[in-house]
């Protein structure tokens, strides 16, 4: 391992406010290989038994400012005949992601980390059947 001497301009990790004030390089390096990306399906949203649509969620005060969000097309699932199956429900699969939100009262390059729940697709589950006791 190569030890890099700490520069005077680097923040001190021991400082109390280190985790509150971190400089982040926002340049995105695409780590996915071409093969992995080409296998990523874009047609599942139509082929699924619980199909979904995608909407472009824009927030100029957020990084990333554009996030594509899924919404289930139907409350029920679609059967092999293309009809809605009332014994099966479409449910949204959500993922919690971290985003940076601009702090408007501060300079335009000051952000805070926020959690955001994003719909990434839908899946089909059986309806809960409640038996009368």
């Amino acid at each position: 391992a190569v030890l890099i001497p700490q520069s005077s301009v680097c923040p001190n990790a021991e400082a109390n406010n280190f985790l509150q004030n971190v400089k982040v390089n926002l340049k995105v390096i695409n780590s996915l290989s071409s093969k992995a990306s080409s296998r990523r399906p874009s047609d599942y949203l139509n082929r699924s038994t619980s199909p979904w649509t995608l909407s472009r969620n824009e927030d100029p005060d957020r990084y990333p400012s554009v996030i594509w969000e899924a919404q289930c097309r139907h409350q029920r699932c679609v059967n092999a005949e293309g009809k809605l199956d009332h014994h099966m429900n479409s449910v949204l699969i959500q993922q919690e992601i971290l985003v940076l939100k601009r702090e408007p009262e501060k300079c335009p390059f000051t952000f805070r980390v926020e959690k955001m729940l994003v719909g990434v697709g839908c899946t089909c589950v059986s309806s809960i059947v409640r038996h009368a006791s």
Partner: antibody, heavy 119, light 107 residues
Framework: EVQLVQSGAEVKKPGASVKVSCKAS????????FHWVRQAPGQGLEWIGV????????AYNQNFRDRATLTADKSTSTAYMELSSLRSEDTAVYYC????????????WGQGTLVTVSS | NIVMTQSPSSLSASVGDRVTITCKAS??????VGWFQQKPGKSPKLLIY???NRYTGVPSRFSGSGSGTDFTFTISSLQPEDFATYFC?????????FGQGTKLEIK
């Protein structure tokens, strides 16, 4: 080298449809959004809509929502813009452009496709 | 929709001149403004993004400034190849909109 190569000029009659293609090369097709913009003769640029080839999502300018359809074919790294119910005022050069979603700007543009609508 | 009002619509200048084009947004667009150059029969070419960042390979004579609603694009010393039409564009929120363009002609 990133390249966006569009299909050739088209002449259409009013009421017809046109489908313009944009073939991408030099990068991973599914990583970035494709936007479509048009420019009528001697006019400014007008945004039509966007498709993300990675997830199939689309969004449209309200003015084109009922007539424009954006699609993408990952197997050929090609994006398409279909415009239906053509009228004379749709005569324009149509451009595809790549949008860097994280960085937030259009970097590469196709060479443009002239669509002429005339009876 | 956000309206981008660009001025002047046309401009005559000589090689070596300093030229300034302005763009005013109908509402705040933060710094989400780009500037493009377009030559006849060609597609737009990105010069400036995020109001003031020069795109890769763009000569230093091109610069941009501004935030909120007022933006400025400057060519410090005009070169013969700079005579073209210039557009501003906002990508703050869709539908993304463009200025009407400034045609820069040789005096």
């Amino acid at each position: 080298e990133v390249q966006l190569v569009q299909s050739g000029a088209e002449v259409k009659k009013p009421g017809a449809s046109v489908k313009v293609s944009c073939k991408a090369s030099g990068y991973t097709f599914t990583d970035y959004e494709f936007h479509w913009v048009r420019q009528a003769p001697g006019q400014g640029l007008e945004w039509i809509g966007v498709i993300h080839p990675g997830n199939g999502g689309t969004a449209y300018n309200q003015n084109f929502r009922d007539r424009a359809t954006l699609t993408a074919d990952k197997s050929t790294s090609t994006a398409y813009m279909e415009l239906s119910s053509l009228r004379s005022e749709d005569t324009a050069v149509y451009y595809c452009t790549r949008f860097l979603t994280y960085e937030g700007y259009f970097d590469y543009w196709g060479q443009g496709t002239l669509v002429t609508v005339s009876s | 929709n956000i309206v981008m009002t660009q001025s002047p619509s046309s401009l005559s200048a000589s090689v070596g001149d300093r030229v300034t084009i302005t763009c005013k947004a109908s509402q705040s667009v933060s710094i989400d403004v780009g500037w493009f150059q377009q030559k006849p029969g060609k597609s737009p070419k990105l010069l400036i993004y995020h109001a003031s960042n020069r795109y890769t390979g763009v000569p230093s004579r091109f610069s941009g400034s501004g935030s909120g609603t007022d933006f400025t694009f400057t060519i410090s010393s005009l070169q013969p190849e700079d005579f073209a039409t210039y557009f501003c564009q906002q990508d703050y929120s869709s539908p993304y909109t463009f200025g009407q363009g400034t045609k820069l002609e040789i005096k």
